[in-house]
Interface confidence: low
């Protein structure tokens, strides 16, 4: 992710006796929560690898960059960061690797400047549809988020709710159309089998979409047509077999796009002909000379760019009387 890093040193460590500060009282200007490090010059608070079980109540009002990584937060309740006065400057919030399994509706409310949120490496079995929108209104107030990092948030199989994980994540992304301003979305390493067709159409401002290291088999029902600002599309390390004409045309029509397709099990049969022709002509695919066939066996490791139409055949379908088991 590209979450900002602190540019200043001079971090002050907190004294343990400050841990019980009340969130309703304005924190002292130089106060730093227990188990955290603070730099007012860098507007940064780091509470990293401290096994915290809840968000500190006494965060300093100056904080712009908050790192709460490597903790044991388990649940983010509604208003987890609501303070008096509000954390009006908080722009970047990193909660990665903090054992979150539930993020409730309105967890990020009252953070008017929150631009970058990283929830990666948390086993999110229960992500409320209103985690980012804050309300169940059909159209919510726009979220200030422009960068949302959700890499590796898939919970273990036995902890998943009895519903589609893809559907749960997409519901949170689309609720109330609050994330219309989202520019970067990272969803890598989430075992996604498919991409719900609505998700991209309702995130028209995306510049960067990372879907790498999932299990996507096809993009047939996914439309990229309206993503005119899209600059990078990461589809490496999925289960893609072929890209069909409709998808190829849509990608080619995006004015600034770069597509990354490495390490997919491309099936080099007659259905691949259009994609091979397109690859030879297009400049949008980065590292296209590295793409190789995985199937059928006779084509394994052949470079897609080196194939011609004679190489791409489909075995004839035998009449039933000649088929064998």
């Amino acid at each position: 992710s590209s979450s900002p890093t602190s540019s200043a040193s001079s971090f002050s460590s907190s004294a343990p006796f400050l841990a019980s500060a009340v969130s309703a009282q304005p924190p002292l200007p130089d106060q730093c929560p227990a188990l955290c490090e603070c730099s007012e010059a860098a507007r940064t608070v780091k509470c990293v690898n401290r096994n915290l079980t809840e968000v500190p109540t006494d965060l300093p009002a100056y904080v712009r960059n908050l790192f709460l990584t490597g903790n044991q937060l388990a649940v983010l309740p509604a208003g987890a960061f609501a303070r008096r006065p509000p954390l009006a400057e908080l722009a970047a919030l990193n909660l990665s690797g903090s054992r979150l399994d539930e993020v409730r509706a309105g967890a990020f409310e009252h953070l008017p400047s929150l631009r970058q949120l990283d929830l990666s490496h948390n086993p999110l079995a229960d992500l409320s549809p209103f985690a980012f929108s804050g309300s169940n209104a059909s159209v919510s107030a726009p979220s200030p988020l422009v960068e949302l990092i959700l890499n590796h948030i898939v919970p273990p199989e036995d902890e998943r709710q009895n519903r589609s994980f893809e559907g749960m994540v997409v519901a949170a992304l689309l609720a109330g159309r609050a994330l219309q301003g989202l520019r970067r979305l990272e969803l890598a390493s989430n075992h996604f089998l498919y991409l719900p067709r609505d998700v991209l159409a309702q995130l028209p401002s995306l510049r960067h979409l990372d879907l790498s290291n999932n299990s996507l088999v096809s993009l047939t029902y996914v439309s990229f047509r309206n993503l005119t600002h899209l600059e990078s599309l990461h589809l490496e390390d999925n289960a893609l077999k072929v890209l069909h004409n409709g998808t190829l045309a849509e990608l080619q029509g995006l004015p600034h796009i770069r597509v990354f397709l490495d390490n997919n099990p491309w099936v080099c049969d007659c259905h691949m002909a259009d994609m091979v022709t397109w690859l030879k002509e297009t400049e949008v695919v980065q590292g296209k000379d590295r793409l190789t066939c995985a199937y059928p066996e006779k084509m394994r490791n052949r470079v897609l760019l080196e194939l011609n139409s004679a190489d791409l055949d489909c075995d004839p379908i035998l009449p039933p009387s000649l088929q064998t088991s």
């Epitope: 590209s2 900002p4 540019s7 004015p255 600034h256």
Partner: antibody
């Protein structure tokens, strides 16, 4: 805080190339965001020229596409503007600016005046 | 290219007044508009983004509004330091384009 500082020759001869440097402190240009060049002509009209992003990719104003190049030196945390075949019409104050993920320019350099004259 | 038109090159106002600077886009740009203030000899400074969001540290007397093609920057209770030039910018599509600027002057 993020700071940007332009530098380069203040006088360039017609038909030559204009080269400017933007030095960034307080944030690594490879960590994120978009690093732009914008110029302001006498009379104060502003023109967006193009950017290089944190991945090293470019996007240029089509009106300049055949003449412009924006590159970077990540080891020095600098990015560069090169504008070829300049004419007197390229006389302007040149700014470098950081573009946020949602496209507007939050941080600007102080600007450097470049005059194109024989 | 999208043309951003600030029809009034100069506007007169007085300290304490309320003034509205307008900007018109040649086509629909949604809310993808920013406003900048530029004082003589300085670089532009961001005031408003996404048509109505105030940038951090900008006084709340500055407000932005508008959608589609018509946008307004309103300064209530004008201060002497506000008497300078203001630019709008669209970022709905490339190339990004700016308005020609509006100078606020003392009446």
């Amino acid at each position: 805080d993020v700071q940007l500082q332009e530098s380069g020759p203040g006088l360039v001869k017609p038909s030559q190339s204009l080269s400017l440097t933007c030095s960034v402190t307080g944030y690594s240009i490879t960590s994120g965001y978009y690093w732009n060049w914008i110029r302001q002509f006498p009379g104060n009209k502003l023109e967006w020229m193009g950017y290089i992003n944190s991945d090293g990719s470019n996007n240029y104003n089509p009106s300049l596409k055949n003449r412009i190049s924006i590159t970077r030196d990540t080891s020095k945390n600098q990015f560069f503007l090169k504008l070829n075949s300049v004419t007197t019409e390229d006389t302007a104050t040149y700014y470098c600016a950081r573009e946020e993920y949602d496209y507007w320019f939050a941080y600007w350099g102080q600007g450097t005046l470049v005059t194109v004259s024989a | 290219d999208i043309v951003m038109t600030q029809s009034q090159k100069f506007m007169s106002t007085s300290v304490g007044d309320r003034v509205s600077v307008t900007c018109k886009a040649s086509q629909n740009v949604g809310t993808n508009v920013a406003w900048y203030q530029q004082k003589p000899g300085q670089s532009p400074k961001a005031l408003i983004y996404s048509a109505s969001n105030r940038y951090s540290g900008v006084p709340d007397r500055f407000t932005g509004s508008g959608f589609g093609t018509d946008f307004t920057l309103t300064i209530s209770n004008v201060q002497s330091e506000d008497l300078t030039e203001y630019f709008c910018q669209q970022y709905n599509s490339y190339p990004y384009t700016f308005g020609g600027g509006t100078n606020l002057e003392i009446k």
